[in-house]
Amino acid sequence: LIIGFGISGRHSITVTTVASAGNIGEDGILSCTFEPDIKLSDIVIQWLKEGVIGLVHEFKEGKDELSEQDEMFRGRTAVFADQVIVGNASLRLKNVQLTDAGTYKCYIITSKGKGNANLEYKTGAFSMPEVNVDYNASSETLRCEAPRWFPQPTVVWASQVDQGANFSEVSNTSFELNSENVTMKVVSVLYNVTINNTYSCMIENDIAKATGDIKVTESEIKRRSHLQLLNSKAS
């Protein structure tokens, strides 16, 4: 959580950002809130990116003002116009690219004054893993698949019964480049699994951590998945 205060102007206003991560090829949100003004026309929002000459986005007098927008963001940005009046300056970024990573500044001007705060935006690929029983294998085998990751993650298996056990000797992980030549499909196979146990396939890179659980009993199979962005917690 980063809180910034304006330096010049009548007064400083509080602007707050939260570090976040974007999933390439999908839409992302750069989060920014501010001390609101009573009239929309008195609010100016500017998003800037370190190393980029033009603006990422500008919103003023109640509408987008994109004449100074940098080419790399053309047609890809939007604010939540109906929420600006309540202090939401967050930016929606369409079709996130690897090159969108960097330091952004959310700069706000209202009738009370000015304020800004920086935001670290990471980009990569992350997806939910699915764990299944591999019935084609000669022994009891689990297969964990996740369609899109970047940068290359680590994969670790764990089990509820054998807590702390190292499964690296009885597992095999491969990374297959997807058609766009950036993201990769993650496939990890765990051999010699036992029944009535819960196994977890944990995939992690510097952006996200995802877990796929599977519980295999004689009568049923239960699955659960969870994904957590690593750098969006308050700091």
Partner: antibody, heavy 122, light 113 residues
Framework: QVQLQESGPELVKPGASVKLSCKAS????????IHWLKQSPGQGLEWIGW????????HYNDKFKGKATMTADKSSTTAYMQLSSLTSEDSAVFFC???????????????WGQGTLVTVSA | DIVMSQSPSSLAVSVGEKVTMSCKSS????????????LAWYQQKPGQSPKLLIY???TWESGVPDRFIGSGSGTDFTLTVSSVKAEDLAVYYC?????????FGAGTKLEIK
């Protein structure tokens, strides 16, 4: 139709806290601000602040910072206001009201609850 | 904070008469960007909650009778009731929403003779 139903009257002791509720119906709760106002014989109508249930954003009148805390529960479409460290000065009728239709300002206040009388007395 | 001053504090008129009440703000409520006056009028009948009558100084809220007329600009505003009815017995408040915190006048109490 839009309705705001406030909780019943409260008799509270000095120093205590009270939590008032405002149940909204007839519109999309997360799309509009809910405002709280105080009406007392000595001070007339005073605006306390608003909450935007869609995001939880709040904005307070400086005069009521530390006195009032606004929250909202999306699942029950209910807004709440907690008043703390109550004194006789806090005895008043408190209203909730819904913010306006326009995205250019959260005013005026077109829909009001019936009001909750809070009496602070030992 | 913007101070809203209403006058008179009370007045008594007969049914059918025309009545005007005044509201003055300590600073202009006319916003140059949109040429709107950020002022509203509310009616509060005894034992009830306030009801919005007029916003943007002169725009009727839906369902409000056209005998209620809002006028004025800048710092001086007027609410006129062209032909008073018995049901108009109430306190009338002006409200500025030009800047935070929004503020209200002390009200004008309309009584029926």
């Amino acid at each position: 139709q839009v309705q705001l139903q406030e909780s019943g009257p409260e008799l509270v002791k000095p120093g205590a806290s009270v939590k008032l509720s405002c149940k909204a119906s007839g519109y999309i709760f997360t799309d509009y601000t809910i405002h709280w106002l105080k009406q007392s014989p000595g001070q007339g109508l005073e605006w306390i602040g608003w909450i935007y249930p869609g995001s939880g954003h709040t904005h307070y009148n400086d005069k009521f910072k530390g006195k009032a805390t606004m929250t909202a529960d999306k699942s029950s479409t209910t807004a709440y206001m907690q008043l703390s460290s109550l004194t006789s000065e806090d005895s008043a009728v408190f209203f909730c009201a819904r913010g306006g239709e326009s995205i250019t300002t959260v005013f005026p206040l077109a829909y009001w609850g019936q009001g909750t009388l809070v009496t602070v007395s030992a | 904070d913007i101070v809203m001053s209403q006058s008179p504090s009370s007045l008594a008129v007969s049914v059918g008469e025309k009545v005007t009440m005044s509201c003055k703000s300590s600073q202009s409520l006319l916003y140059s960007s949109d040429q709107k006056n950020y002022l509203a009028w509310y009616q509060q009948k005894p034992g009830q909650s306030p009801k919005l009558l007029i916003y943007w100084a002169s725009t009727w809220e839906s369902g409000v009778p056209d005998r209620f007329i809002g006028s004025g600009s800048g710092t001086d505003f007027t609410l006129t009731v062209s032909s008073v009815k018995a049901e108009d017995l109430a306190v009338y408040y002006c409200h500025q929403y030009y800047s935070y915190p929004p503020t209200f006048g002390a009200g004008t109490k309309l009584e029926i003779k």
